[in-house]
């Protein structure tokens, strides 16, 4: 009689994580008598997956009634597959004895597990940066299998080319991770911009996963300042305005200085928003020129988002205004954009 053969017809089987894997195995003879065992891997480190004779294998069920005496089908189903189950599975016939001894092995079936990548997480720099600067964004996704994966970067729908991507580990693994770093040059118009990391994988059926980062979290647009003197409101009073334009984020503190001395400090509150997402704000100062004998240097000093202060000055010619006798203090009004003169 021809010697028993162990036939594993499938060289490979691919299963999505969470599904069941069916591993086929038949023998060509009922002799010798003895059980079947299934192993993952070969050599001393192989793992016992199923023993027909004894043991508890909660995730494994036999496809046919392997207890029947004439049964020659020893196929198994493994439920709730995870990437950790990937490997080569061997169906092995044992010869009955004390103990049973290994008789013949099948050629093996390689089980590969398709696992979806996690949602990409995009993170930007820890500190804000100003336009014209280059900033780095990272994108990470984990837990996918097989290893082949495609990652693309976009800024407002335009594909970026300056990025580096690594898939780890380099060798064989149950699942993989991808890490990519993209370089983005900021512009003044980027407050409303988005950086998108897009990951495509065989498990996603052509519907890539996306992770986004808003450049509003990254950019700082410094303000431009303009100090102007308005027409005289009343005799001896001059209205000076400081226009703070095109800044982002909103966090801004303005200080008026008269000849270098602090006159008033205020925080930007009711700002107007521009189409590009930046803000404008205006502050005004009412100066009583009769309180000054000499010309006055008025300075609008702005501290934006914790950065070093920027300032703009305006020289007020006192000689051009008639002085009021007996007055030696400057009467100042607390002005803001809420009570502007327009």
């Amino acid at each position: 009689e021809e010697e028993l053969q162990v036939i594993q017809p499938d060289k490979s089987v691919s299963v999505a994580a969470g599904e069941s894997a069916i591993l086929l195995c038949t023998v060509t003879s009922l002799i010798p008598v003895g059980p079947i065992q299934w192993f993952r891997g070969a050599g001393p480190a192989r793992e016992l997956i199923y023993n027909q004779k004894e043991g508890h294998f909660p995730r494994v069920t036999t496809v046919s009634e392997s207890t029947k005496r004439e049964n020659m089908d020893f196929s198994i189903s493994i439920s709730n597959i995870t990437p950790a189950d990937a490997g080569t599975y061997y169906c092995v016939k044992f010869r009955k004895g004390s103990p049973d001894t290994e008789f013949k092995s099948g050629a093996g079936t390689e089980l590969s597990v398709r696992a979806k990548p996690s949602a990409p997480v995009v993170s930007g720099p820890a500190a804000r940066a100003t336009p014209q600067h280059t900033v780095s964004f990272t994108c990470e996704s984990h837990g996918f299998s097989p290893r082949d994966i495609t990652l693309k970067w976009f800024k407002n729908g335009n594909e970026l080319s300056d990025f580096q991507t690594n898939v780890d580990p380099v060798g064989e693994s149950v699942s993989y991770s991808i890490h990519s770093t993209a370089k983005v040059v900021l512009t003044r118009e980027d407050v409303h911009s988005q950086v998108i990391c897009e990951v495509a994988h065989v498990t996603l059926q052509g519907d890539p996963l996306r992770g986004t980062a808003n450049l509003s979290e990254t950019i700082r647009v410094p303000p431009t300042l303009e100090v102007t003197q308005q027409p005289v409101r009343a005799e001896n009073q001059v209205n000076v305005t400081c226009q703070v334009r095109k800044f982002y984020p909103q966090r801004l503190q303005l200080t008026w200085l008269e000849n270098g001395n602090v006159s008033r400090t205020e925080t930007a509150s009711t700002v107007t928003e521009n189409k590009d997402g930046t803000y404008n704000w205006m502050s005004w100062l009412l100066v009583n020129v009769s309180a000054h004998r000499d010309d006055v240097k008025l300075t609008c000093q702005v501290e934006h988002d914790g950065q070093p202060a920027v300032s703009k000055s305006h020289d007020l010619k006192v000689s051009a205004h008639p002085k009021e006798q007996g007055s030696n203090t400057a009467a100042e009004n607390t002005g803001s954009n809420e009570r502007n003169i327009y």
Epitope: G43, P44, A45, E47, P99, E102
Partner: antibody
Framework: EVQFQQSGTVLARPGTSVKMSCKAS????????MHWVKQGPGQGLQWIGA????????TYNQKFKGKAELTVVTSTSTAYMEVSSLTNEDSAVYYC???????????????WGQGTLVTVSA | DIQMTQSPSSLSASLGERVSLTCRAS??????LNWLQQEPDGTIKRLIY???SLDSGVPKRFSGSRSGSDYSLTISGLESEDFVDYYC?????????FGGGTKLEIN
């Protein structure tokens, strides 16, 4: 009681070969992989390879392929290792140990032979 | 190959002291780690298997644990016979690899 009895100390010339033995007793020889481990003088332990007596299946550490050859005689429950083309680097104590026919935690490298000292000298 | 980095390579301690030896695995080995003890005469004995299971006949002052890829052997209350060499071994995948060893010396 499970025991491994290893052959005695060997003094060998460079370029020659030595064959050492490890006789197992106290359990079923064919249910286990027999492993060999090297320890150079004042050095750590290095796994050489293993053999499965049922079908003479062998697995080697790449570093020892072509240097060590593992065999068994199941009728005497004895594992053998031959180390060839001896150099000073092969001077070491060689141990045998075992693991179950599949990866059973409790059975990995529980029992060890007493070691065979090989000295290579001209 | 999986590298097992064992530290310290040598350790001086006093009787009754508590000491810990560590092995770091370069790849995931799960719980497949043994701790071995080697006497000066070369005799090797397994103390711990599967990271934390104590072999029969091994005193309870020996214990094994894991934190991520770091595996530790702790001896609480050193006795004179404990001042020998210790090795970790990973048996997750071939080639099976050992740590470089720790020589435990008496202060």
């Amino acid at each position: 009681e499970v025991q491994f009895q290893q052959s005695g100390t060997v003094l060998a010339r460079p370029g020659t070969s030595v064959k050492m033995s490890c006789k197992a007793s106290g359990s079923t020889f064919t249910s286990y992989w027999m492993h060999w481990v090297k320890q150079g003088p004042g050095q750590g332990l290095q796994w050489i390879g293993a053999i499965y007596p049922v079908n003479n299946d062998t697995t080697y550490n790449q570093k020892f392929k072509g240097k060590a050859e593992l065999t068994v005689v199941t009728s005497t429950s004895t594992a053998y290792m031959e180390v060839s083309s001896l150099t000073n680097e092969d001077s070491a104590v060689y141990y045998c140990t075992r693991s179950f026919y599949y990866s059973l935690d409790a059975a990995w490298f529980v029992y060890w032979g007493q070691g065979t000292l090989v000295t290579v000298s001209a | 190959d999986i590298q097992m980095t064992q530290s310290p390579s040598s350790l001086s301690a006093s009787l009754g002291e508590r000491v810990s030896l560590t092995c770091r695995a370069s790849q995931d080995i799960g719980s497949r780690l043994n701790w071995l003890q080697q006497e000066p005469d070369g005799t090797i004995k397994r103390l711990i298997y599967a990271t934390s299971s104590l072999d029969s006949g091994v005193p309870k002052r020996f214990s094994g644990s894991r934190s991520g890829s770091d595996y530790s052997l702790t001896i609480s209350g050193l006795e004179s016979e404990d001042f020998v060499d210790y090795y970790c071994l990973q048996y997750a995948s071939s080639p099976f690899t050992f740590g470089g060893g720790t020589k435990l010396e008496i202060n």
